[in-house]
């Protein structure tokens, strides 16, 4: 988004030391990887691995990097222009309706149903009725496990922040 060189473009030894890089705001805004000073005169770089900003902004502070929860794996680290990307561990998934936690994938489909989709970090296994082919959603009935699945292969992040 910005032609300026930002912190994640630099090799680790080149990244800003404790004193942060400053530049001038453009039309009252600072570029990704920076925040604006309280007096509005300077753009101050975010601290690599600690905080970030993803767009042009007038933030007085960069945003704190997300720390992946236990039960999550870090797909990519936090840079000055991008938040950490976390993904549910193998065998668990994050639903859109409850993004704050990873839930265990079901191990099989209810009786009379067949598995048509694997467990992925962003979805449970998918089951359909053998005859009608209609999807099954909701809680697993007490009698199940006629079809077992192996955990899906992670392919892309389930939640991108920034």
């Amino acid at each position: 988004e910005s032609a300026l060189i930002t912190q994640q473009d630099l090799a680790p030894q080149q990244r800003a030391a404790p004193q942060q890089k400053r530049s001038s705001p453009s039309e009252g805004l600072c570029p990704p990887g920076h925040h604006i000073s309280e007096d509005g005169r300077d753009c101050i770089s975010c601290k690599y691995g600690q905080d970030y900003s993803t767009h042009w902004n007038d933030l007085l502070f960069c945003l704190r990097c997300t720390r992946c929860d236990s039960g999550e794996v870090e797909l990519s680290p936090c840079t000055t222009t991008r938040n950490t990307v976390c993904q549910c561990e193998e065998g668990t998934f994050r639903e859109e309706d409850s993004p704050e936690m990873c839930r265990k994938c079901r191990t099989g489909c209810p009786r009379g149903m067949v598995k048509v989709g694997d467990c992925t970090p962003w979805s449970d296994i998918e089951c359909v009725h053998k005859e009608s082919g209609t999807k099954h959603s909701g809680e697993v009935p007490a009698v199940e496990e006629t079809v077992t699945s192996s955990p899906g292969t992670p392919a892309s992040p389930c939640s991108l922040s920034g």
């Epitope: 993803t54 902004n57 704190r64 938040n83 409850s98 939640s159 991108l160 922040s161 920034g162």
Partner: nanobody, 126 residues
Framework: EVQLLESGGGEVQPGGSLRLSCAAS????????VGWFRQAPGKEREFVSA????????YYAESVKGRFTISKDNAKRTLYLQMSSLRAEDTAVYYC???????????????????WGQGTLVTVKP
């Protein structure tokens, strides 16, 4: 139930200005970041701007930087987008949106937002 109602759209000439409003029915409006997105005909919905929950500090897409200003009145549960120096490429349906639970401090991607208004059409033409 979360309800978001945008208003203020209309037809304007290039270089003109408009102010969009978005009224929210939800009490958590005052503790949530909120954003504006737009969708031009035949194109994907894209991020325009988002503002922090307390109404101080915002993100802007590079395409609107310096021309659009987002603001938020928590007491009135209303979000605003002041648009100036409008261009033909700003023509789109503009949506306000509230994020899903558990997203980042200032979400800026479509998938991070779970509650959307019906949109208001902005047309910029000579």
């Amino acid at each position: 139930e979360v309800q978001l109602l945008e208003s203020g759209g209309g037809e304007v000439q290039p270089g003109g200005s408009l102010r969009l409003s978005c009224a929210a029915s939800v009490s958590t409006f005052g503790t949530s970041p909120v954003g504006w997105f737009r969708q031009a005909p035949g194109k994907e919905r894209e991020f325009v701007s988002a503002i922090r929950w307390e109404g101080v500090g915002a993100y802007y897409a590079e395409s609107v930087k310096g021309r659009f200003t987002i603001s938020k009145d928590n007491a009135k549960r209303t979000l605003y987008l002041q648009m100036s120096s409008l261009r033909a490429e700003d023509t789109a349906v503009y949506y306000c949106a509230l994020p899903r639970r558990g997203e980042s401090e200032l979400p800026s991607t479509v998938k991070e937002y779970g509650y959307w208004g019906q949109g208001t059409l902005v047309t910029v033409k000579p």
